[in-house]
């Protein structure tokens, strides 16, 4: 049994990083593997992961980590029984992909403005919290063309527009995710989508 | 919201004991390590040790070996830092603090004063 | 356990800019992340700066931190007469056992 890809890992910032691999034929990866990761700190304790398949030969594992924090390196050891198939480290600040913020919701009784306003996925204290910025993303349901990205490069999780510049009287879609430059992170998921009916009064020409 | 609630000042005699604690509320108590510091009159920052609230590990200033004892109570989110055969040098205000590599959240200190 | 060199005092007139320097070597500064610390009197230290240069949630960013080798830097502009208190700067000293140490502190008077 050997390791055809090693783990790579990226980190919430926050509690959960998601290591992946590949082995080098099919594997039951939790029966078979253990993926072993300790914080090269005072007091730390050795914790154990067990991976769950990802595809025939590939392996997934959730290691869960608590105040996570730029200075902190892990040490990896992934185990086959008595066996050390690979050994490594995992810096989480420099492999970041935030969460997905969450529970956008569009506001359509402001007058012909659309306010989209969702929440920041991380708690104030968290360090990430106060470094993300954003991307919303908004198209039509019924024309694919009509597909915008607008970037929310201010920490405020809102976004103002002008209703009349989408069309009238169809439906639109909202999603947005989130990256912190100073972290150099990945975007996140997409949030789940938002549906509204767009409408306003065309101004009245003469 | 995260907060650090350290006990009463103290008054002791030369020889004897003291045991400081420091209430944690607003946070998984177990998640975090607490560390102590203390900071004599009119001088700076000395730290004297951590304690990791999950498995109730130590690990002390070498210069308090053997005369700090660091303990936590999960029941309560509590953690203690007892300070043995006290001298005038040890008369200072004595703080507890949560992180790791550095410190975010600071208990508001407990005074010691320690006189014959 | 070896202590970081910081200048005793330092002042500047309200708005000014003002630095205050910490001094490590390869075995602290030079191998660690640096913090700063603020202590109004008779209050606790807060944390100002982490991870070198990083500001914490709530903290204007008329406080700024650098690093380099084996010495740090806290720079304040627009200086305030809220600002006047001592800074403290932190790291981890790696020589075994690793530990936490401190500045010396300096004070800050805004005149």
């Known amino acids: 049994m050997k390791v055809l890809q090693e783990p790579t890992c990226v980190s919430d910032y926050m509690s959960i990083s998601t290591c992946e691999w590949k082995m080098n034929g099919p594997t039951n990866c939790s029966t078979e593997l253990r993926l072993l990761y300790q914080l090269v700190f005072l007091l730390s304790e050795a914790h154990t992961c067990i991976p769950e398949n990802n595809g025939g030969a590939g392996c997934v594992c959730h290691l869960l980590m608590d105040d996570v924090v730029s200075a902190d390196n892990y040490t990896l050891d992934l185990w086959a029984g008595q066996q050390l198939l690979w050994k490594g480290s995992f810096k989480p600040s420099e492999h970041v992909k935030p969460r997905a913020p969450g529970n956008l919701t569009v506001h359509t009784n402001v007058s012909d403005t659309l306010l989209l306003t969702w929440s920041n996925p991380y708690p104030p204290d968290n360090y990430l919290y106060n470094h993300l910025t954003y991307a919303v993303n908004i198209w039509s349901e019924n024309d694919p063309a009509d597909f915008r990205i607008y970037n929310v490069t201010y920490l405020e999780p809102s976004l103002r527009i002008a209703a009349s510049t989408l069309k009238s009287g169809i439906s639109y879609r909202a999603r947005v995710r989130a990256w912190a430059q100073c972290y150099n992170t990945t975007w996140s998921e997409w949030s789940p989508s938002t549906k509204w009916h767009n409408s306003y009064r065309e101004p009245f020409e003469q | 919201q995260v907060q650090l609630v350290q006990s009463g000042a103290e008054v002791k005699k030369p020889g004897a004991s003291v045991k400081v604690s420091c209430k944690a509320s607003?946070?998984?108590?177990?998640?975090?390590?607490m560390h102590w510091a203390r900071q004599a009159p009119g001088q700076g920052l000395e730290w004297m040790g951590i304690i990791n609230p999950s498995g109730g590990s130590t690990s002390y200033a070498q210069k308090f070996q053997g005369r700090v004892t660091m303990t936590r109570d999960t029941s309560t989110s509590t953690v203690y830092m007892e300070l043995s055969s006290l001298r005038s040098e040890d008369t200072a205000v004595y703080y507890c603090?949560?992180?790791?590599?550095?410190?975010?959240?600071w208990g508001k200190g407990t005074l010691v004063t320690v006189s014959s | 356990q070896s202590v970081l060199t910081q200048p005793p005092s330092v002042s500047a007139a309200p708005g000014q800019k003002v630095t205050i320097s910490c001094s490590g070597g390869?075995?602290?500064?030079?191998?660690?992340?640096v913090s700063w610390y603020q202590q109004l009197p008779g209050t606790a230290p807060k944390l100002l700066i982490y991870d070198n240069n990083k500001r914490p949630s709530g903290i204007p960013d008329r406080f700024s931190g650098s690093k380099s080798g084996t010495s740090a830097t806290l720079a304040i502009t627009g200086l305030q007469t809220g600002d006047e208190a001592d800074y403290y700067c932190?790291?981890?000293?790696?020589?075994?056992?690793?530990?936490?140490?401190f500045g010396t502190g300096t004070k800050l008077t805004v005149l």
């Open positions: 390869s075995s602290n500064i030079g191998n660690s992340y």
């Open positions: 603090a949560r992180g790791k590599w550095w410190w975010q959240y």
């Open positions: 607003g946070y998984a108590f177990t998640s975090y390590y």
């Open positions: 932190g790291t981890w000293d790696t020589s075994s056992p690793p530990q936490p140490i």
